[in-house]
């Protein structure tokens, strides 16, 4: 808290300019009018104030706007944004994408802070859904943003927004998140032809069900092993050897190197050894010839 002292003669600020960096904290408090500051916020960012001085300027704005800053001020906060707490930000009503971009720019190149997370949360909640332009902006600044959302939050993403998602945006997503995103992607890309569709849907396939993988196996897609290894184990298990061979195309040879890792390991255990041998890869661990496989889950469903 800065003590209230009279402004020395001749030091009253008529505008926000670089001369203010030479003011002591108490002089800033006494000589800068909060209303002047609010109308000239765009200048603050161009002036190399110390963090201590920024604290004083923030204090002046807090007194002027105890219920939260108007968007006209928020948009021009610049470095002063680095002085805001999540509690401050929760008082804001940010509706303009330009304001969001301006504030994200301040933290560009640095990891997401609680302040940025709060800002994004306020913005998205205010919009009601994560539209394409917002998603475009957020993933440009934070490629991992999408995967930081809960499945519940992801459910508010409209399929049209999926066009903004790049493969790297999904790198850290877990299966629960991909389960939500995959149907949206399928819907978004449904009018594309086979090869183009596969290029777009590939990053989302960690959420694909068995029937969709079976359908893809009929389309000569040549899925790479990295994508195959990210598929849901429960979706891969029912695939036949022939279907996996068609799905992977020339990449099928990569199964040998992955035979001890899921989902390949679990899939091998479900296949007849005879069928695995047809691949000529030396995959071992399949069901020996002459053994009968009972699908107990099917039996339970019938009883």
């Amino acid at each position: 808290e800065v003590e209230k002292t009279a402004c020395p003669s001749g030091k009253k600020a008529r505008e926000i300019d670089e001369s203010l960096i030479f003011y002591k904290k108490w002089e800033l408090e006494a000589c800068v009018d909060a209303a002047l500051l609010a109308t000239q916020m765009d200048r603050v960012n161009a002036i190399p104030f110390t963090y201590e001085q920024l604290d004083v300027l923030k204090h002046k704005l807090d007194e002027l706007y105890p219920q939260g800053y108007p968007e006209s001020v928020i948009q021009h906060l610049g470095y002063l944004f680095l002085k805001m707490s999540p509690e401050d930000i929760r008082k804001w009503n940010v509706t303009s994408l330009e304001t969001l971009k301006a504030l994200l720019e301040v933290n560009k190149g640095h990891e997401m802070s609680p302040q940025v997370a709060t800002l994004i949360d306020r913005f998205v909640k205010g919009r009601g859904q994560l539209d394409k332009d917002t998603l475009d902006t957020l993933t440009a600044f934070y490629p991992g943003y999408l995967c930081s959302l809960s499945p519940e939050e992801l459910s508010s993403v409209p399929p049209s927004s999926i066009w903004a998602v790049r493969p790297q945006d999904l790198d850290t997503c877990d299966p629960r998140q991909l389960d939500v995103l995959y149907p949206k992607a399928r819907l978004a890309f449904q009018n594309m032809n086979g090869s183009e569709y596969f290029v777009k849907i590939q990053s989302f396939l960690g959420g694909a069900p068995t029937e969709d993988l079976k359908a893809l196996s009929q389309q000569n897609v040549s899925m790479d092993l990295a994508t195959f290894m990210k598929l849901r184990t429960d979706a891969v298990l029912p695939l036949t050897v022939a279907e996996v061979q068609k799905l992977l195309g020339p990449h099928v040879e990569g199964l040998k190197a992955e035979e001890r890792h899921r989902p390949v390991r679990d899939w091998i255990l479900r296949q007849r050894q005879d069928d695995l041998d047809t691949l000529g890869l030396g995959l071992q661990g399949g069901i020996p010839n002459g053994y009968l496989v009972l699908d107990l889950s099917m039996q339970e469903a019938l009883s």
Epitope: P48, T50, N107
Partner: nanobody, 119 residues
């Protein structure tokens, strides 16, 4: 963390020149603005000059035209203060300061280098 070490101070006659240096090490990529402050015996800390992250320089009125602040953003960030036409009233401990990006933004200080101007 950023470490700052000043050098270049000393005793000089009025009208003479000195060049102060401040070497920064540690998380130098996160440095935003850099500054020279000074503190004369029994007086408060006074900002002498600032160089912003975009290279713009700002000077205290009484040193404008005599002092020049500059910085290099190479692997070893260095801050300089070229002081010409020195006056006895410039005598003080000159301290280097840098601040960094982030929440909360942090301020870092050197130990200072003494400048004494004799008349």
């Amino acid at each position: 963390q950023v470490q700052l070490v000043e050098s270049g101070g000393g005793l000089v006659q009025a009208g003479g020149s000195l060049r102060l240096s401040c070497a920064a090490s540690g998380s130098i990529s996160s440095i935003r603005h850099m500054r020279w402050y000074r503190q004369a015996p029994g007086k408060g800390l006074e900002l002498v000059a600032t160089v912003s992250n975009d290279g713009s320089a700002y000077y205290l009125g009484s040193v404008k035209g005599r002092f020049t602040i500059s910085r290099t953003n190479a692997k070893n960030t260095l801050l300089y203060l070229q002081m010409n036409s020195l006056k006895p009233e410039d005598s003080a401990l000159y301290i280097c300061n840098a601040d960094t990006w982030g929440w909360p933004g942090a301020d870092y200080w050197g130990q200072g280098t003494q400048v004494t101007v004799s008349s």
